[in-house]
């Protein structure tokens, strides 16, 4: 009679994570008598997966009834597969011995490959806000996928970006992989409503890529422009001066009025108007009692936007003559003042 052979008909098996893997194995003879064991890997460090004779293997079930005397099918099923299960599985026939069974013959092995979906891409931007015309870096990360082949693309408002670098780790063989990509994005003044999108395509996603997004509203700071103007006289001794704060983002803004360098009033932007591009406008006014001043008054609108150093714009109010409509002009002091004008 021909010597027993252990047949593993499948050189490789590909299974999606979470599914059940079937590893087939048949023997060509009932002799010699002895159990079958399944191992992952070969050599002294191999891992026991299933032992017909003894042990508890909750994830493993046999395809046929191994208790039947004439059974020669030793195929197994492994449930709830994860990338950690990837490897080469060997079906090994043992010959009954005393005191221990002796390894008799091994199958050629079946390589189990696990297809695992990538995690949802996570996109993160710079630690602090940046202003228009600057290039900032965004990162995209996705983990736990297998096989290694993966495609990553970047978009800004639907337009594909080309300035990015991508790494898939580890470089060598692994049960699962991670992808890390860094894209450079140029901010514009119109980017408050913009989005940066990282798109990951993988064989496990069946043509439906995963996307991670970052809103540039979290990244951009659009500095305001300031304009101080004097309004027509309200009453004989009163002048209304307005400070227009335009095109700023985010909304966090505090405005201080100074009269000849002394704080007159401080307020926080609340009832702002929103522009189509997502930036804000705000106006503050100051009623100045001209009769309370002997000399010309230097009015300064000082703005602190989003925690940045304060910026200001000044207006000289002439009180020597009867107040009338005036335009903004520069200080007639001996040296530049300590306020910094935005323009």
């Amino acid at each position: 009679e021909e010597e027993l052979q252990v047949i593993q008909p499948d050189k490789s098996v590909l299974v999606a994570a979470g599914e059940t893997a079937t590893l087939r194995c048949t023997a060509t003879s009932l002799i010699p008598v002895g159990p079958i064991q399944w191992f992952r890997g070969a050599g002294p460090g191999r891992e026991l997966i299933y032992n017909q004779k003894e042990g508890h293997f909750p994830r493993v079930t046999t395809v046929s009834d191994l208790t039947k005397r004439n059974n020669m099918d030793f195929s197994i099923r492994i449930g709830n597969i994860t990338p950690a299960d990837a490897g080469t599985y060997y079906c090994v026939k043992f010959r009954k011995g005393s005191p221990d069974d002796v390894e008799f013959k091994s199958g050629a092995g079946t390589e189990l490959s696990v297809r695992a979906k990538p995690s949802a891409p996570v996109v993160s931007g710079p630690a602090a806000r940046a202003t228009p015309q600057h290039t900032v870096s965004f990162t995209c990360e996705s983990h736990g996928f297998s096989p290694r082949d993966i495609t990553l693309k970047w978009f800004k408002n639907g337009n594909e970006l080309s300035d990015f670098q991508t790494n898939v780790d580890p470089v060598g063989e692994s049960v699962s992989y991670s992808i890390h990509s860094t894209a450079k994005v140029v901010l514009t003044r119109e980017d408050v409503h913009s989005q940066v999108i990282c798109e990951v395509a993988h064989v496990t996603l069946q043509g439906d890529p995963l996307r991670g997004t970052a809103n540039l509203s979290e990244t951009i700071r659009v500095p305001p422009t300031l304009e101080v103007t004097q309004q027509p006289v309200r009453a004989e001794n009163q002048v209304n001066v307005t400070c227009q704060v335009r095109k700023f983002y985010p909304q966090r803004l505090q405005l201080t009025w100074l009269e000849n360098g002394n704080v007159s009033r401080t307020e926080t932007a609340s009832t702002v108007t929103e522009n189509k591009d997502g930036t804000y406008n705000w106006m503050s006014w100051l009623l100045v009692n001209v009769s309370a001043h002997r000399d010309d008054v230097k009015l300064t609108c000082q703005v602190e936007h989003d925690g940045q150093p304060a910026v200001s714009k000044s207006h000289d109010l002439k009180v020597s003559a009867h107040p009338k409509e005036q335009g903004s002009n520069t200080a007639a002091e001996n040296t530049g003042s300590n306020e910094r004008n935005i323009y």
């Epitope: 630690a127 602090a128 202003t131 228009p132 500095p223 940045q308 323009y343």
Partner: antibody
Framework: QVQLVQSGAEVKKPGASVKVSCKAS????????IHWVRQAPGQGLEWMGD????????ANNQKFKGRVTMTRDTSTSTVYMELSSLRSEDTAVYYC????????????WGQGTLVTVSS | DIQMTQSPSSLSASVGDRVTITCKAS??????VAWYQQKPGKAPKLLIY???SLETGVLSRFSGSGSGTDFTLTISSLQAEDFATYYC?????????FGGGTKVEIK
């Protein structure tokens, strides 16, 4: 008081790279951009680019076609400007200067670093 | 890139003279214009920013004006320490650009 202190003069061969440092003090480093401006002997001023230490955001003069790399080390309040593939026409004094992002011109300047490119 | 055309490239003047330097931008740059003074072997010094705002510590004989594309630096009464080279610069859009400079020399 606000100070920007630059590294010392350098002599480089064509094709080499140079890295100039600019150490800031006297203000909150992450609130202001650091700009780089160069001036060839007897010539005018030329803006190279800037970096915002807070966000790491950079703006570059495309004339330099990727030869300029600006980095920052917030732990030492230092900005670095590296210029690669040097040629003789890169011989110049290189200045760093600070500005409030999006608002102001350059109000404080470093003392300048002379970079000489010669074979 | 925005071109900043500065004129004249040089001028000779005497102490006490009123000096005017002009700068023309190739496109609208709003009010984002600065003026610098540079003396030989020194870094530039900011005089005016935002077209007309005097930098802290700068004497009031320096003034700036203009808007849109046309800008002017005026020294009302030239002093001995004012002989230097002056540059205009736009900071509305990158790349930031400078004028070619105006060298103010003693007549």
């Amino acid at each position: 008081q606000v100070q920007l202190v630059q590294s010392g003069a350098e002599v480089k061969k064509p094709g080499a790279s140079v890295k100039v440092s600019c150490k800031a003090s006297g203000y909150t480093f992450t609130d202001y951009e650091i700009h780089w401006v160069r001036q060839a002997p007897g010539q005018g001023l030329e803006w190279m680019g800037d970096i915002h230490p807070g966000s790491g955001g950079t703006a570059n003069n495309q004339k330099f076609k990727g030869r300029v790399t600006m980095t920052r080390d917030t732990s030492t309040s230092t900005v670095y400007m590296e210029l690669s593939s040097l040629r003789s026409e890169d011989t110049a004094v290189y200045y760093c200067a600070r500005a409030v992002s999006g608002y102001y011109a350059m109000d404080y300047w470093g003392q300048g670093t002379l970079v000489t490119v010669s074979s | 890139d925005i071109q900043m055309t500065q004129s004249p490239s040089s001028l000779s003047a005497s102490v006490g003279d009123r000096v005017t330097i002009t700068c023309k931008a190739s496109e609208d740059i709003y009010d984002r214009v600065a003026w610098y003074q540079q003396k030989p072997g020194k870094a530039p010094k900011l005089l005016i920013y935002g077209t007309a705002s005097l930098e802290t510590g700068v004497l009031s004989r320096f003034s700036g004006s203009g808007s849109g594309t046309d800008f002017t630096l005026t020294i009302s009464s030239l002093q001995a320490e004012d002989f230097a080279t002056y540059y205009c610069q736009q900071y509305w859009t990158t790349p930031w650009t400078f004028g070619g400079g105006t060298k103010v020399e003693i007549k």
